[in-house]
């Protein structure tokens, strides 16, 4: 493994439709890819009216945009879908939304706001 | 590498059975979702349900529920179609595929494709 | 069900040209998004996956992008070996559905 990369070979499993599907509704998934493809983990919900419903969770396969993220945190503004993903065995186990802020000057200090977590 | 290797050619009579095979050799078979695919001469794909072997129990498309049973046996990594009551429309090329994942990321190998003809 | 839709059915194109699928979901299906190419009387191959993925051995000149009920598949510069039928297949939820296809022609 390449040093300071987080090896991911499982990951938390959950179906919200899992009875439609026939599956279980939660477990652990381990990932499999090709040997020089990286392996991620990735949370997908909702929100509906302040209360979280997951949807998805599960194993993601070499996606840039999951590259080198230890946290799994959701950073678009308000999407219809929530998914963020992570490097890290069963780093899908908690997930957050941390909007991105459009960059304007401050008239005062920046605040940086914790990120809410969910899990 | 995974592969995936099915049954040979059916012809079939309408109202008979077909049971497809499909034999996985590389990784972990017990752990892959296996899907299966038809395709009808000159048409498009149909998700026919899936299978995650160590889970045992198989998912289908409503429209072939109660006339589809997708199995695996895991001590010979095959996975298996059997689609009764046949009919000439079930005249297709059937594809056993593994999925990426569990969470049915993509559809990344195919078997070669089992052709079965239904006619009297 | 999830109903697909692509646009267009057929088109035509040169060696060299960029190309655009479109593929629409009848409900949203958040990146559970895949792109397969077939040849005729070969199985399809998965071309991308999660709505802008490429697996490997898949050519950059492939590109996906969409989320939730609108996707897009853009092949730049053309290849004489990307002539083929394009289908989009969503698994976001059961039952997986296909798109009905776009076929890609010479021109």
């Known amino acids: 493994a390449i040093l300071g990369r987080s090896e991911t070979q499982e990951c938390l499993f959950f179906n919200a439709n899992w009875e439609k599907d026939r599956t279980n509704q939660t477990g652990v998934e381990p990932c499999y890819g090709d040997k020089d493809k990286r392996r991620h983990c990735f949370a997908t919900w909702k929100n509906i009216s302040g209360s979280i419903e997951i949807v998805k969770q599960g194993c993601w396969l070499d996606d840039i945009n999951c590259y080198d993220r230890t946290d799994c945190v959701e950073k678009k503004d308000s999407p219809e879908v929530y998914f963020c993903c992570c490097e890290g065995n069963m780093c899908n186990e908690k997930f957050s939304y941390f909007p991105e802020m459009e960059v304007t000057q401050p008239t005062s200090n920046p605040v940086t706001p914790k990120p809410p977590y969910y899990n | 590498q995974v592969q995936l290797v099915q049954s040979g050619a059916e012809v079939k009579k309408p109202g008979s059975s077909v049971k497809v095979s499909c034999k996985a050799s590389g990784e972990s078979f017990e752990h892959f979702q296996i899907s299966w695919v038809r395709q009808a001469p000159g048409q498009g794909l149909e998700w026919m349900g899936g299978?995650?072997?160590?889970?045992?129990?198989?998912n289908y498309a409503q429209k072939f529920q109660g006339r589809v049973t997708i199995t695996a046996d895991e001590s010979t990594s095959t996975a298996y179609m059997e689609l009764s009551s046949l009919r000439s429309e079930d005249t297709a090329v059937y594809y056993c595929?593994?999925?990426?994942?569990?969470?049915?990321?993509?559809?990344?190998?195919w078997g070669q494709g089992t052709m079965v003809t239904v006619s009297s | 069900e999830i109903v697909m839709t692509q646009s267009p059915s057929s088109l035509s194109a040169s060696v060299g040209d960029t190309v655009t699928i479109t593929c629409r979901a009848s409900?949203?299906?958040?990146?559970?998004l895949a792109w397969y190419q077939q040849k005729p009387g070969k199985a399809p191959r998965l071309l991308i996956y999660g709505a802008r993925v490429l697996p490997s051995g898949v050519p950059s000149r492939f590109s996906g992008s969409g989320s939730g009920t609108h996707f897009t598949l853009t092949i730049s510069s053309l290849q004489p070996e990307d002539f083929a039928t394009y289908f989009c297949q969503q698994s976001y939820s059961t039952p997986f559905t296909f798109g009905p296809g776009t076929k890609l022609e010479i021109k």
């Open positions: 409900q949203g299906v958040s990146r559970w």
């Open positions: 595929v593994k999925d990426l994942t569990w969470t049915n990321l993509g559809l990344d190998i």
């Open positions: 299978i995650i072997p160590i889970y045992g129990t198989a």
